[in-house]
């Protein structure tokens, strides 16, 4: 169900504070704009108020998309989706946000990485990712290369490799050359998920060839 309201909310934290405390899809408004976007809000995990910016769970959505698609978002907020780089960039440049990445493997294990500071640069700077203050159970070293890299897609090669990481590993991501993670890689089902260089990778938790079962990237204001 879509949960719409006359109020304007910039993120799921504002939705939560307005009294909407159930998980679901809500309409958010771009900062300093009337443009709207649909996002899934997790109102239960870790106190709620989380804006889901990425979800992988079943391979139902193709993540080998263009720069424009990653800019505006794609997929279904109730399932697999990418919220959109432009919205996330605008949002995270308004105030300080934390980023939590929740991961599941095929053996029933779960882990997370929490970054206490997160923002994306503007499109002019290729939505470069900035992260600080890593804690969590998915590795003491960041699987997103630091300092952050520019975002790359199959039609927008901004990585640090003479190869084209997005074409080789599939999906849009903040590739280095090509780096220790890609949560937007190919979805591989159980028993086909090992020794896959182009899968859903978080190196400092499961190594380079392991493709994960499920991932969620979520953001919330640091002062929530």
């Amino acid at each position: 169900d879509y949960k719409d309201d006359d109020d304007k909310f910039r993120d799921c934290a504002e939705v939560f504070k307005s009294g909407h405390t159930t998980n679901g899809i809500y309409t958010l408004t771009f900062p300093n704009s009337t443009e709207e976007i649909k996002a899934y809000c997790d109102m239960e995990a870790g106190g709620g108020g989380w804006t889901i910016i990425q979800r992988r769970e079943d391979g139902s959505v193709d993540f080998q998309r263009t720069w424009k698609e990653y800019k505006v978002g794609f997929g279904n907020p109730s399932g697999e989706y990418w919220l959109g780089n432009e919205f996330v960039s605008q949002l995270t440049n308004q105030q300080r946000y934390v980023l939590k990445i929740h991961l599941k493997d095929w053996e029933g294990n779960e882990a997370y990485s929490l970054y206490e500071h997160f923002y994306l640069s503007s499109e002019e700077l290729n939505y470069r990712i900035h992260l600080k203050g890593l804690t969590g159970t998915a590795g003491k070293i960041s699987s997103i290369s630091q300092p952050g890299n520019d975002f790359s897609t199959k039609d927008g090669d901004n990585d640090k490799c003479i190869c084209k990481c997005s074409q080789m590993l599939t999906g849009g991501w903040w590739f280095a050359a090509c780096g220790p993670s890609n949560l937007n890689g190919m979805y591989y089902p159980q028993r086909q998920n090992t020794n896959k260089f182009n899968g859903i990778k978080w190196y400092y938790w499961k190594g380079s060839g392991y493709s994960l079962k499920a991932t969620t990237m979520m953001i919330r204001p640091a002062d929530f």
Partner: antibody, heavy 121, light 107 residues
Framework: DVQLQESGPGLVKPSQSLSLTCTVT?????????WNWIRQFPGNKLEWMGY???????SYNPSLKSRISITRDTSKNQFFLQLNSVTPEDTATYYC??????????????WGQGTSVTVSS | SIVMTQTPKLLLVSAGDRVTITCKAS??????VAWYQQKPGQSPKLLIY???NRYTGVPDRFTGSGYGTDFTFAISTVQAEDLAIYFC?????????FGGGTKLEIK
């Protein structure tokens, strides 16, 4: 290539204000990152003073908060340090530097060559 | 503020030696620790960021490690041009703070 250059008076009288300019070339200070002032006292101790981010927000060292102001002139791609009510203990080499994160403190990858300031009557 | 206690203050070494400098944070700094080199008459230069990442163009004889409160910086084979003061810096919490420095002198 990114370059930073400090400028300002080398001698300031006690109780007066210290004003320094950092001119940045090769990168727009409104594009990204935070733009810092750091000082190094005789004896080599380093102290972070504060920054102005690409968005214009500022953060200061609490030990200086009542005396410090960092501003910028985006048309000239410059940012400034003003330190009020100086004493001889403010004698130091002052550096401007770019940090690798735009909304918070972080490591600093580009530094100016530094300018020496003496506070004395 | 997080206090960064850096040891030793002075290192007297010969070319070819391996040297190690340590920094201890008064509380956890996660992996948000950098190491700088300052040669005589110059400004500090970033060598290592996020505890273990070598900055662009930095020779691989310089390495960093650590997490939480204990951090180590090493030069595997000291060269004459490594004469400098080395500083650690935490930027996990504001204000960022520096260690007192280690002066590396060549015998």
């Amino acid at each position: 290539d990114v370059q930073l250059q400090e400028s300002g008076p080398g001698l300031v009288k006690p109780s007066q204000s210290l004003s320094l300019t950092c001119t940045v070339t090769g990168y727009s200070i409104t594009s990204d990152y935070a733009w810092n002032w750091i000082r190094q006292f005789p004896g080599n101790k380093l102290e972070w003073m504060g920054y102005i981010s690409y968005s214009g927000s500022t953060s200061y060292n609490p030990s200086l908060k009542s005396r410090i102001s960092i501003t910028r002139d985006t048309s000239k791609n410059q940012f400034f340090l003003q330190l009020n009510s100086v004493t001889p203990e403010d004698t130091a080499t002052y550096y401007c530097a770019r940090s690798t994160f735009g909304h918070y403190v972080s490591s600093m990858d580009y530094w100016g060559q530094g300018t020496s300031v003496t506070v004395s009557s | 503020s997080i206090v960064m206690t850096q040891t030793p203050k002075l290192l007297l070494v010969s070319a070819g030696d391996r040297v190690t400098i340590t920094c201890k944070a008064s509380q956890s700094a996660s992996n948000d620790v950098a190491w700088y080199q300052q040669k005589p008459g110059q400004s500090p230069k970033l060598l290592i960021y996020y505890a273990s990442n070598r900055y662009t163009g930095v020779p691989d004889r310089f390495t960093g490690s650590g997490y939480g409160t204990d951090f180590t910086f090493a030069i595997s084979t000291v060269q004459a041009e490594d004469l400098a003061i080395y500083f650690c810096q935490q930027d996990y919490s504001s204000p960022p703070t520096f260690g007192g420095g280690t002066k590396l002198e060549i015998k």
